[in-house]
């Protein structure tokens, strides 16, 4: 059993999130993940989900009673989602930490917009669409 | 020429982001995008970048002088990044709109954590690594 399971159960107790009523009114993430099978689509969604959890954990960083659980889960996210690649994790963190209200950040973002847009679609990089994208609009 | 280019130039004027000094102290997004060649890695990063732009545009939604430019660019992002797929865009928006300080959202997130974690690595879904991932750790 992966180490995160035990620690996630510990967090469930702390957040009182083990009760069946928590699932009322649908899921946050699971329903959305079920919609997307293509790996690149899943990464688009998981990127937002992982950043949500990192933000949530940051908000509870001073709570010693759950620190071990949080650290173990974050470590497992590093392994699973970032493939143990610190550079990938660091680049991701940089992006999540940019402040949208910082004037210098705003100017830089707009300055880079054209180039960012040019790289957004897979075709821009590969020069061709993948066959799977030709069969059905992903 | 894609329609976003003219509108992005318009935003550059509005944000005073055309000057070369804007590029001082490095880039926000372009340097990071340069690091990642594998499509799924790029989607992880681009997901954060696109959500940044959406947040930025939201902050200026009442400014009539740039509304046409913002709408054109958002539309082009829908085409390029979400492949004109409204469901993909809607699911993405849902994820970006969850409040990390909402107690019900926190409880749901922790309730779903074990299942989310189980799906994080590509191997979990496919049972095998893609050959391109075999060449170099992404």
């Amino acid at each position: 059993q992966d180490p995160y399971v035990k620690e996630a159960e510990n967090l469930k107790k702390y957040f009182n999130a083990g009760h069946s009523d928590v699932a009322d009114n649908g899921t946050l993430f699971l329903g959305i993940l079920k919609n997307w099978k293509e790996e690149s689509d899943r990464k688009i969604m998981q990127s937002q989900i992982v950043s949500f959890y990192f933000k949530l954990f940051k908000n509870f960083k001073d709570d010693q009673s759950i620190q071990k659980s949080v650290e173990t889960i974050k470590e497992d996210m590093n392994v699973k989602f970032f493939n143990s690649n610190k550079k990938k994790r660091d680049d991701f963190e940089k992006l999540t930490n940019y402040s949208v209200t910082d004037l210098n950040v705003q100017r830089k973002a707009i300055h880079e917009l054209i180039q960012v847009m040019a790289e957004l679609s897979p075709a821009a990089k590969t020069g061709k669409r993948k066959r799977s994208q030709m069969l059905f609009r992903g | 020429q894609d329609p976003y280019v003219k509108e992005a130039e318009n935003l550059k004027k509005y944000f005073n982001a055309g000057h070369s000094d804007v590029a001082d102290n490095g880039t926000l997004f372009l340097g990071i995008l340069k690091n990642w060649k594998e499509e799924s890695d790029r989607k992880i990063m681009q997901s954060q970048i696109v959500s940044f732009y959406f947040k930025l545009f939201k902050n200026f939604k009442d400014d009539q002088s740039i509304q046409k430019s913002v709408e054109t660019i958002k539309e082009d992002m829908n085409v390029k990044f979400f492949n004109s797929n409204k469901k993909k865009r809607d699911d993405f928006e849902k994820l970006t709109n969850y409040s990390v300080t909402d107690l019900n959202v926190q409880r749901k997130a922790i309730h779903e954590l074990i299942q989310v974690m189980a799906e994080l690595s590509p191997a979990a879904k496919t049972g095998k690594r893609k050959r391109s991932q075999m060449l170099f750790r992404g």
Epitope: P3, T72, E75, K87 | W36, K37, M134, R137
Partner: antibody, heavy 120, light 111 residues
């Protein structure tokens, strides 16, 4: 100050076993991944194995996979390397190293090494 | 298998600058951090550059690291060469399957 002290090296016959230990101090042991790196006489550095901070993820070089097992006891601040089916080419100085984060990172601090000799 | 290739040796006079290259065999070297370790004879290695271009505390700013995506290589530059810089230098990064990879090492000789 970070201190890493390897022990358990020695002379062993081909096919035999050894267990190396690395006693760590001066940092929060469970928060960092740990690695073993070896250096054959007159040769370069060769990474052997690594383990994440919690011990939940382990990584091995192809040359030792299936023969060596890395483990850690966070309550004792100790890293281990169980080496089975030893070969002459496993002869080397074995270094224990602290990684720079909780998965694979840069090798921030190194021990002085312990020598393993595999010979009949 | 992913490999990192370094020159066997470089030599230069005191006060001069030496650059050691580290070429990746496949993939994109920019997709992982590159580290550089110094090893003096009879001692354990120590990091002089980590995460592409960061210097650990205590390492002089004469040491610098860089990545060149176009040539898929990393470089360690030592400026103002000193006799104490004479050592073996190893670059290190990672391969696809979470294996740590070292270059073969470069012997730096101060003439």
């Amino acid at each position: 100050e970070v201190q890493l002290l390897e022990s358990g090296g020695g002379l062993v016959q081909p096919g035999g076993s050894l267990r190396l230990s690395c006693a760590a101090s001066g940092f929060t042991f469970s928060s960092y991944a740990m690695s073993w790196v070896r250096q054959a006489p007159g040769k370069g550095l060769e990474w052997v194995s690594a383990i994440s901070g919690s011990g939940g993820s382990t990584y091995y070089a192809d040359s030792v996979k299936g023969r060596f097992t890395i483990s850690r006891d966070n309550s004792k601040n100790t890293l281990y390397l169980q080496m089975n089916s030893l070969r002459a080419e496993d002869t080397a100085v074995y270094y224990c190293a602290k990684d720079g984060w909780n998965a694979l990172g840069w090798l921030e601090s190194w021990g002085k090494g312990t020598t393993v000799t595999v010979s009949s | 298998n992913f490999m990192l290739t370094q020159p066997h040796s470089v030599s230069e006079s005191p006060g001069k600058t030496v650059t050691i290259s580290c070429a990746g065999s496949s993939g994109s070297i920019a997709s992982n951090y590159v580290q550089w370790y110094q090893q003096r004879p009879g001692s354990a290695p120590t990091a002089v550059i980590y995460e592409d271009n960061q210097r650990p505390s205590g390492v002089p700013d004469r040491f610098s690291g860089s990545i060149d995506s176009s040539s898929n290589s990393a470089s360690l530059t030592i400026s103002g060469l000193k006799t104490e810089d004479e050592a073996d230098y190893y670059c290190q990064s990672y391969s696809y399957n979470n294996q740590v990879v070292f270059g073969g090492g470069t012997k730096v000789t101060v003439l």
